[in-house]
């Protein structure tokens, strides 16, 4: 029978990219386990990750039910084995997370340039419309399905032989840019939600250059 007291979780942090959402916390448990609950502001508390020794809990299944809601989570600490609990009057110890609104806060994942096609002095660049874990009618929605016109992509492109970058923007997943005939260009894309105050931009996509496999060239 142990004497180590149960301690409350701390540093509760949301980690979310393209709506894949995990709550993380500390400390690594010693003689205790955790159960997580999640709720909307007006909803009920739903338990997840029961009696776990992990310090993270995947809450994606819950938040994708309505990504525009604001969620709150709490992490309960329970004594493992015959360890005494510190909860007052039998009340379990728990700690609340910060509020989290997936639509406004999920990080935008790194985009991928799916293809590019040159026709004369025009290049059509297509950014992959990434699938999210948000469902509607039993099918997974893409990032564009979820964000609509709130989501734009910025394309940075430049002549392979120089460093001066130009930019183009689109509220679809396609760019049509002007290039000089016979000159090779490189580009990368970035997802942006201009209306946001936090997590406005994704990381840059990998750089793609003309003359590589993803491209098609027609005179």
């Amino acid at each position: 029978s142990g004497t180590t007291n149960t301690v409350a979780a701390y540093n509760l942090t949301w980690k979310s990219t393209n709506f894949k959402t995990i709550l993380e916390w500390e400390p690594k448990p010693v003689n205790q386990v955790y159960t997580v609950q999640i709720s909307t502001k007006s909803g009920d508390w739903k338990s997840k990750c029961f009696y776990t020794t992990d310090t993270e809990c995947d809450l994606t299944d819950e938040i994708v039910k309505d990504v525009k809601q604001t969620y709150l989570a709490r992490v309960f600490s329970y004594p493992a084995g015959n360890v005494e609990s510190t909860g007052s009057a039998g009340e379990p110890l728990y700690e609340n997370s910060p509020e989290f609104t997936p639509y406004l806060e999920t990080n935008l994942g790194q985009p991928t340039i799916q293809s590019f096609e040159q026709v004369g002095t025009k290049v059509n660049v297509t950014v992959e419309d990434e699938r999210t874990l948000v469902r509607r009618n039993n099918t997974f929605l893409s990032l564009r399905d979820v964000f609509g016109k709130d989501l734009i992509y910025t394309l940075y492109y430049w002549k392979s032989s120089s460093s001066g970058k130009k930019t183009a923007k689109t509220n679809t997943n396609e760019f049509l840019i002007d290039v000089e005939k016979g000159v090779s260009y490189c580009f990368f894309a970035q997802a942006v939600i201009p209306s946001r105050t936090v997590n406005r931009k994704s990381t840059d996509s990998p750089v793609e250059c003309m003359g590589q496999e993803k491209g098609e060239f027609r005179e």
């Epitope: 508390w45 739903k46 338990s47 029961f50 009696y51 020794t53 309960f76 329970y78 379990p92």
Partner: antibody
Framework: QVQLVQSGAEVKKPGASVKVSCKAS????????MHWVRQAPGQGLEWMGI????????VYAQKFQGRVTMTRDTSTSTVYMELSSLRSEDTAVYYC??????????????WGQGTMVTVSS | DIQMTQSPSSLSASVGDRVTITCQAS??????LNWYQQKPGKAPKLLIY???NLETGVPSRFSGSRSGTDFTFTISSLQPEDIATYYC?????????FGGGTKVEIK
């Protein structure tokens, strides 16, 4: 098929201890929590606690804290429940029950046949 | 601990009748509720999990629903083999707790 087979009936004197075993077969032992639930004669069901066979971590209902010990032997896919300082009110059928899949983690989808423990002087 | 108040404690109905059992939680437990059937001298059997999901292999005459903290278990057409005691169980809060049971008999 998936089953849980428990040890036989026990008669104990007050103050003694009893250890009940539950052998699992037909599934991956480490992947499912195991619970212990008891039922006094003519009464309802009472949850005692849970053991994670993967790491051996246990959580007990406060009522049994300090008196119950749940252990497991991964080599034989067996879990054990030991209850000490027995009193007459511990007379009951003791069941082991498997926690369900991740979909229904705390639903008891497979039950042992039960072990009758009688505490009498 | 969360109290699960089950009613009625017993009932008698005819074969083919619709039978309804309710379970009320002392506080909000979301849909974290299961229903079990226990026949005399046997271990309980899971029928419904997460308030309304039918366990594999369980006849479709059994169903469950939720309204706030009130949960309902229904047998749409009582069969002789349904004679048993039925229990609800919540798992949203530690410790897990059961209702007191409802004994179903045939008239």
């Amino acid at each position: 098929q998936v089953q849980l087979v428990q040890s036989g009936a026990e008669v104990k004197k007050p103050g003694a201890s009893v250890k009940v075993s539950c052998k699992a077969s037909g599934y991956t032992f480490a992947n499912y929590y195991m619970h212990w639930v008891r039922q006094a004669p003519g009464q309802g069901l009472e949850w005692m606690g849970i053991i994670n066979p993967s790491g051996g971590i246990t959580v007990y209902a406060q009522k049994f804290q300090g008196r119950v010990t749940m252990t497991r032997d991964t080599s034989t896919s067996t879990v054990y429940m030991e209850l000490s300082s027995l009193r007459s009110e511990d007379t009951a059928v003791y069941y082991c029950a498997r926690g369900g899949s991740k979909v229904a983690a705390l639903a008891f989808d497979i039950w042992g046949q039960g072990t009758m423990v009688t505490v009498s002087s | 601990d969360i109290q699960m108040t089950q009613s009625p404690s017993s009932l008698s109905a005819s074969v083919g009748d619709r039978v309804t059992i309710t379970c009320q939680a002392s506080q909000d437990i979301s849909n974290s509720l299961n229903w079990y059937q226990q026949k005399p001298g046997k271990a309980p059997k899971l029928l419904i999990y997460d308030a309304s999901n039918l366990e594999t292999g369980v006849p479709s005459r059994f169903s469950g629903s939720r309204s706030g903290t009130d949960f309902t278990f229904t047998i749409s057409s009582l069969q002789p083999e349904d004679i048993a005691t039925y229990y609800c169980q919540q798992y949203n809060f530690h410790p897990l707790t059961f209702g007191g049971g409802t004994k179903v008999e045939i008239k």
